[in-house]
């Protein structure tokens, strides 16, 4: 057992153009907060994947203001280590997680808004009981600098804190075998434990994990009298040699324990100690629960009480992720029906509607004829939601209630005459031309000119006129 | 403004079921989640559930067999139905609006008392 | 679930005095996911505080609240008349959403 502590040295800018003035968005004032998140093994991780070592949350900073005139190179942080306990030993290797995370305090409603600003995963290896690391790292525009450790808490020493110290028996010195336990003098290292089941009468260990058979005894926990062993008639401990030694393939070989489990032989089967967040015969199952704080942003962890059930976040509008981690573009979405432009206020999504439409999402046809009627004999037609009026010949205007002047367009061409008629005008033509509305000239001959062949007809082809 | 309106029976009969109606005005029904709370005569808060326009719900599991929450975006409207109602069920029941920040309750209803008598 | 303990069930205090309220969960609340409300007779109740410490908008500054993971304190600095009424505490960190029992705040 022991401690994995990280210290935020400082979090802001990185050098270099395009570094942002300030983590807070113009909604107004926030503060950061830190969350560091730690998985076994050097392997890729997907994101969502449960913090199988364990995680921690950061107090809240001071509230951070913009100063247009300064910006802070180092921005105000949450005071203290970062501790995460772990209850089994030190895996040695493993992934780091940092997040920065920025809380808007701005006038929202409900309350304040989390984002994720920044995060950084780093591979290490790490012994326990060294000295602190120091590291700066780089994410987008942001740059963090922080040191680590990992320490062992007592009884445990070490460098994965598996050896346990224990006062000495003997007041000068240890036993044979066993130093003293740094930094404690005055205590002794213990006998490493052995193979879990091992038989206390037949069998010992100077390994942790191993079980090695004293004369005349054999099987994977030395428990079987040996018989026929070719150990009989040797003297102490079984040597590797004559096969004495935990004989082969017992139920552990292969490590049938999944994500990071230590395996301990049992009497015909074998027993998988899962690291915290993991359960089930060979630990393949994850027992992270609503009790360690899943869901972020404001999300609810719904079910996972009982490691039997998993548990599910459901998360504020604005976020998304098996723990709400991330933030949705809702806009992207595309919510607003019928060309309407989208707008993420932060607090809630509004839809700005074009004319004739209406609703949360733009989603209502308003039907702009619905009691609108045109005068003098005029029809309704309703496109993309504007009323207009298809008026009678003789009158215009929005709902056909003027009277039209037909000849006010100058319909009638090379210097015809107008005249408004009752069912229209009428068009009095200039010498020389002829059509309702004066458009032919009349040849000499006394055949009109009529218009070139429509392309695709050849000459002599029937043609017919619209 | 955001405001939230309760509306329904006042009283209901044993084994009967209750159904109440709150609408929304002043927010989009689409942008929260919207939750049920009760509060029996001289007692304190009890929360019943919860919806989102998308359909998700989540209740109290001590009512979740008697529970429905169903929501109109059309109408900016969601319902509770309360099955197989007993005298201890009778409360004032409120509306209201689930927070942005996270599952606690910014706005509410002024509430509606329903009786639960034969 | 996460059950709420208020105490003290009823406070006797004058205005002018301070009034400390005490909130109680069975397990640690995340995140400090914990809110505080004012209802008084006859009428809804009113968001005072969130994410333990945070004041809702528009609630006057006498009122805060601190703690975290299973203790949690409303404080009103300086009792007003308006202050007396009865008072609820609600975990929103997991389901299912839970409120404490209520602590009357009474003329004394």
């Known amino acids: 057992a022991g401690v994995f502590e990280l210290q935020i040295h400082s979090f802001g800018p990185g050098p270099g153009p395009g570094a942002p003035r300030s983590p807070c968005s113009a909604r107004g004032p926030c503060r950061l907060f830190f969350r560091v998140c730690l998985k076994p093994g050097l392997s890729e991780e997907a994101a969502e994947s449960p913090c199988a070592l364990g995680a921690a949350l950061s107090a809240r900073g001071p509230v951070y203001t913009e100063q247009p005139e300064a910006p802070a190179p180092d921005l105000p942080l949450p005071n203290g280590l970062l501790q995460v306990p772990f209850r089994d030993a030190w895996p040695g290797t493993f992934s780091l997680i940092i997040e920065t995370w920025r809380e808007e305090l701005g006038d929202q409603i409900g309350g304040p808004a989390w984002s994720l600003l920044a995060r950084v995963t780093r591979r290490r290896r790490l012994a326990a009981g060294g000295p602190w690391a120091r590291d700066i790292q780089r994410a987008g525009a942001w740059e963090l600098r922080f040191s680590y450790r990992a320490r062992c808490e007592l009884p445990a020493v070490g460098t994965a804190c598996t050896r346990l110290c224990r006062p000495r028996s003997a007041p000068s010195r240890c036993g044979p075998g066993l130093r003293p336990c740094a930094p404690l003098e005055d205590e002794c290292e213990a006998p490493p434990v052995c193979r879990a089941g091992c038989s206390l009468e037949h069998g010992f260990c100077e390994q942790p994990g191993e079980c090695r058979c004293l004369e005349g005894w054999t099987g994977p926990l030395c428990m079987v009298p040996a018989s026929t062993s070719s150990c009989l008639g040797l003297r102490g401990p079984s040597s590797a040699t004559t096969g004495c030694l935990v004989p082969g393939p017992g139920p552990c070989d292969g490590n049938p324990c999944a994500n990071g489990g230590s395996c301990s032989e049992t009497p015909g089967s074998f027993e998988c100690t899962c690291p915290r967040g993991f359960y089930g015969l060979r630990c393949e199952v994850s027992g992270v629960t609503c009790a360690d704080g899943p869901c972020f942003n404001g999300g609810l962890c719904v079910g996972g009480a009982d490691p039997d059930s998993a548990y599910i976040c459901h998360c504020p509008p604005g976020f998304q992720g098996s723990n709400c981690e991330k933030r949705v573009d809702r806009c992207s979405l595309q919510p607003c029906r019928n060309g309407g432009l989208c707008l993420d206020l932060g607090h809630a999504l509004r839809c700005r509607c074009r004319a004739g439409f209406a609703g949360p999402r733009c989603e209502h046809n308003l039907d702009d004829c619905a009691g609108r009627a045109c005068a003098n004999g005029g029809t309704c037609v309703e496109g993309g939601g504007a009323h207009r009026c298809s008026c009678a010949l003789g009158f215009g205007g929005r709902d056909c209630r003027e009277r039209a002047d037909p000849c006010a367009a100058r319909p009638c061409a090379h210097g015809g005459r107008c005249y408004a008629h009752f069912s229209g005008l009428v068009c009095a033509c200039a010498p020389g031309y002829m059509g309702s509305r004066c458009e032919f000239p009349v040849h000499p001959d006394g055949v009109s000119a009529l218009p070139a062949a429509p392309p695709g007809l050849r000459p002599g082809d029937p043609q017919r006129y619209l | 403004q955001v405001q939230l309106q309760e509306s329904g029976p006042g009283l209901v009969k044993p084994s009967q079921t209750l159904s109440l109606t709150c609408t929304v005005s002043?927010?989009?029904?689409?942008?929260?989640?919207w939750s049920w709370i009760r509060q029996p005569p001289g007692k304190g808060l009890e929360w019943i559930g919860y919806?989102?326009?998308?359909?998700?719900?989540n209740y109290n599991p001590s009512l979740k067999s008697r529970v429905t929450i169903s929501v109109d975006t059309s109408k900016n409207q969601f319902s509770l139905k309360l099955s197989s109602v007993t005298a201890a069920d009778t409360a004032v029941y409120y509306c209201?609006?689930?927070?942005?920040?996270?599952?606690?309750?910014?706005?509410w209803g002024q509430g509606t008392l329903v009786t639960v008598s034969s | 679930e996460i059950v709420l303990t208020q105490s003290p069930g009823t406070l006797s205090l004058s205005p002018g005095e301070r009034a400390t309220l005490s909130c109680r969960a069975s397990?640690?609340?995340?995140?400090?996911?914990l809110a505080w409300y004012q209802q008084k007779p006859g009428q809804a109740p009113r968001l005072l505080i969130y994410?333990?410490?945070s004041r809702a908008t528009g609630i006057p500054d006498r009122f805060s609240g601190s703690g975290s993971g299973t203790d949690f304190t409303l404080t009103i600095s300086r009792l007003e008349p308006e202050d007396f009424a009865v008072y609820y505490c609600?975990?929103?960190?997991?389901?299912?959403?839970?409120f404490g029992g209520g602590t009357k705040v009474e003329i004394k």
């Open positions: 209201a609006r689930i927070a942005v920040a996270g599952f606690f309750f910014d706005y």
């Open positions: 002043g927010a989009s029904i689409s942008s929260f989640y």
């Open positions: 919806i989102y326009y998308s359909g998700t719900t």
């Open positions: 397990q640690s609340v995340n995140k400090n996911y």
């Open positions: 994410g333990a410490s």
């Open positions: 609600q975990q929103y960190d997991r389901s299912p959403l839970t």
